[in-house]
Structure formats: structure tokens, C-alpha cells
Amino acid sequence: ARNGDHCPLGPGRCCRLHTVRASLEDLGWADWVLSPREVQVTMCIGACPSQFRAANMHAQIKTSLHRLKPDTVPAPCCVPASYNPMVLIQKTDTGVSLQTYDDLLAKDCHCI
Amino acid sequence: ARNGDHCPLGPGRCCRLHTVRASLEDLGWADWVLSPREVQVTMCIGACPSQFRAANMHAQIKTSLHRLKPDTVPAPCCVPASYNPMVLIQKTDTGVSLQTYDDLLAKDCHCI
């Protein structure tokens, strides 16, 4: 169950998709990736207040137990619900190759 | 790529499966669940240091960018990699029913 999308903490403060620009050097990829030289990394960042974008029953349980035992049970966490693929031109033993990575760019976010 | 399982922070401090005992009242289920009265909730808790149990390429990127921009990019988060089903006896309009929930109890954990 994907729960409420209204953020009680104010606009943009809850779990959502953010874009962070990163170079190959930033990512530690400079020695094995030729292209792209810069990646617009989409990732999930933000708070997960009670029932906000709860991914499933487990997330709902986590919210309840966090309220009861905040020192033991952490709040749900903002993570990718799905991904966009990304194609890299990478170095290989024989030269270069195109490689698709299916789990690189977040497409959608939820709390779990 | 599921990366290293060695925790550099010390035994038990990194992302792993924990069990938290919770009553139906704790979970807010007392009005719709008859059984079990108490649930051994398995959940993923712990830190996600560099490359520890990295779920995928996205988690590896997140680690790299968190190192560079800790105020902007959070560290990867400890979440379920898979779930165990759980059967609840729940109240219905006509009486009671058995219902299996596939996404209630964490079975295995990773960092993302």
C-alpha cells in the first residue's frame, strides 16, 4: 500500500527524488568508465514521517514501533521503489563495451 | 553486487536482522487482528558503512556521494532484501478470515 503523499514537514522535506550531479571521479569510476563523463544521479532523499509513502505493511509496522521505541527501532527510510536503466561505455579486456545497468538511477521513491 | 559482510564498526553494529517483540496494541492492530496476540517482528537495523552489504550499483554510488557530500546525500540505509510471509487471523464483515501478508517480516537485509 503506497500511503499518503502529503508531507507534514513542509514542501520538499519528505522522501522524494533528488538529482545530484557527479563526475566519474566523484563516483570512483574514472579508471573503468569512458562515458558519460558526468552523471545526473537520481536518488531518494528525505524524511519518512508516519505513513508517508509507506511501501508495504513492514513500513507501517516500523512506523508504529519507531513511535514506541525510537532508540531501538529507526524510522522508515527513503529508498528507491524502482529504477531507470543507464548505459555506460566501459573499458574491457579487449577494448570498450556498452553496458546497461538496471539498478543505477532511482526512478521513484518510497519509505521502508 | 552484494558486497562485504564484515562490519568495520564492530560485531552487531552494522545492518542486520533484529527481532522486536510487539503486541497487537503496539502495532495498532488490536481492532482488526485476532491472532497472533504478539508478533516477533523481524526488521533490518544497523549502520551501512562503505560497501557493507551494498544492494546494487545505486547503493555503491550513494556511498561514494555520501563521502563527498555528507550534508546533501545520506548514507545507504538498512532495509529488507526479502520477506517472510505471515498469516494473520483477522476480523471481517462476516466473521473471521485467514490472510497471508507477504511483506510483513524481513527475512534478509541489505544497504541501499
Epitope: L34, I89, T92, D93, T94, V96, L98, Q99, T100 | -
Partner: antibody, heavy 121, light 110 residues
Framework: EVQLLESGGGLVQPGGSLRLSCAVS????????MTWVRQAPGKGLEWIGI???????YYASWAKGRFTISRDNSKNTVYLQMNSLRAEDTAVYFC???????????????WGQGTLVTVSS | DIVMTQSPATLSVSPGERATLSCQAS??????LAWFQQKPGQPPRLLIY???TLASGIPARFSGSGSGTEFTLTISSLQSEDFAVYFC????????????FGQGTKVEIK
């Protein structure tokens, strides 16, 4: 000697299908990406698509849906399946090793001689 | 879709002169660009890859430059065997990958 040899071209009616082959020798196909390119008579080069060493395929937007690239590493052969052919698909079809914009180690310019496909009724 | 635009369509140059060919990409393709020479009845011949690296066996009078969206092929002193058609090829990668050739520049004897 490293070689690429295209075959399977010929005359085909509009709406018909054809499968082109690119047989390679002198290297192990499994380690390389392979590209298909075509050239209509008297016209420029047109990029069709690539099959990567891992088997992923990438196509020009105009080729998606009608053209399919595949490979059989055990036969050291790459294929181009062309469906719903039209007169404007008449061209010489080339296969080439690599992604072309970066060089593989060793030979930098491995192209076949091409095979002519004529679509006409 | 990525579009590669070459200019000029035809370049008339005297032997021994310098020739400068341009190629523009519709997307930022970094250095994912190659230059090819083609003569009638032959497959293309790779001259430059990675925008500026000379392919093996290619004379040093050929050079490439540029990155992003603007690229140039320079032939410092044209020889008789250099009169041919030249094509640029760009490959754009992000969520998928797609390549495109420019329409070609014919270098002819002035």
C-alpha cells in the same frame, strides 16, 4: 587473419523479411560489441544498432520494432533480422567490430565488405 | 534522438592546402565521436576515435578535436589520396544508447 563477412542479402519484396549474417573469424566474438550500419545507394552512412558483448541491444529509433540484432557466439556470427521491409531499406548493410567511437585493442578498423539488400516488387 | 550535423556538405581544396571539417551533435556526447573516410565501393575507414585519437596506420596529417557538441577534423596538408567523403559518428548514452552519422562532407579537388 581477422575478418568479417556479411551474407544473406538479395532481392526481397516490400513487406517481406530477411536475415543477414555477419560471420567473424580471427577473434572470439563473445568478447566484442558488434555494430550494424547501412548505406543506401549514393547516400550517407546510417547507424542501425549495436549488440554488446553481454547481449544487450541498442537501436536507432527508426530501427526499433522492425530490426533485431542477435548473436550466436558458438557460431561466431552476428545476425540482423529485418521485417516489414520497404523500398527505402534498399542499401548495402555492413557489420563492424566494436562501438566504433572508441577503438578496441589491436585492429582499429574492422568492417565487412557489406551485403546488398534490394527491396522491390 | 541524437542528430549529427556536418558542414560543409562539399569542400573544394587544392592539394597541399589545409581542410577543416565540422560536426555538431544535438546532445552532449563527451568524446564519443569518430571520423571515417570513405571512397566509392569501399567500407568506411576509421581515422579518428574518441574525438581526437589517431587510429593505427593513419597519417599524422589527420587530427581531431572537440568534445561535448562541437567537433572538428583537420587535414593539415591534403594529399591526392585524401579526396573522399568524410563522415562523423556520434554515440549518445544515458538511459539508453543511440548512434548517428553526420550526412557527410565531400572533399573534392579545387
Amino acid at each position: 587473419e581477422v575478418q568479417l563477412l556479411e551474407s544473406g542479402g538479395g532481392l526481397v519484396q516490400p513487406g517481406g523479411s530477411l536475415r543477414l549474417s555477419c560471420a567473424v573469424s580471427g577473434f572470439s566474438l563473445s568478447s566484442y560489441d558488434m555494430t550494424w550500419v547501412r548505406q543506401a545507394p549514393g547516400k550517407g552512412l546510417e547507424w542501425i544498432g549495436i549488440i554488446s558483448s553481454s547481449g544487450n541491444t541498442y537501436y536507432a529509433s527508426w530501427a526499433k520494432g522492425r530490426f533485431t540484432i542477435s548473436r550466436d557466439n558458438s557460431k561466431n556470427t552476428v545476425y540482423l533480422q529485418m521485417n516489414s521491409l520497404r523500398a527505402e531499406d534498399t542499401a548495402v548493410y555492413f557489420c563492424a567490430r566494436g562501438i566504433l567511437v572508441y577503438a578496441d585493442y589491436g585492429d582499429h578498423n574492422l568492417w565487412g565488405q557489406g551485403t546488398l539488400v534490394t527491396v522491390s516488387s | 534522438d541524437i542528430v549529427m550535423t556536418q558542414s560543409p556538405a562539399t569542400l573544394s581544396v587544392s592539394p597541399g592546402e589545409r581542410a577543416t571539417l565540422s560536426c555538431q551533435a544535438s546532445e552532449d556526447i563527451y568524446t564519443n565521436l569518430a571520423w571515417f573516410q570513405q571512397k566509392p565501393g569501399q567500407p568506411p575507414r576509421l581515422l579518428i576515435y574518441a574525438a581526437s585519437t589517431l587510429a593505427s596506420g593513419i597519417p599524422a596529417r589527420f587530427s581531431g578535436s572537440g568534445s561535448g557538441t562541437e567537433f572538428t577534423l583537420t587535414i593539415s596538408s591534403l594529399q591526392s589520396e585524401d579526396f573522399a567523403v568524410y563522415f562523423c559518428l556520434g554515440v549518445y548514452t544515458y538511459i539508453s544508447a543511440e548512434g548517428a552519422f553526420g550526412q557527410g562532407t565531400k572533399v573534392e579537388i579545387k
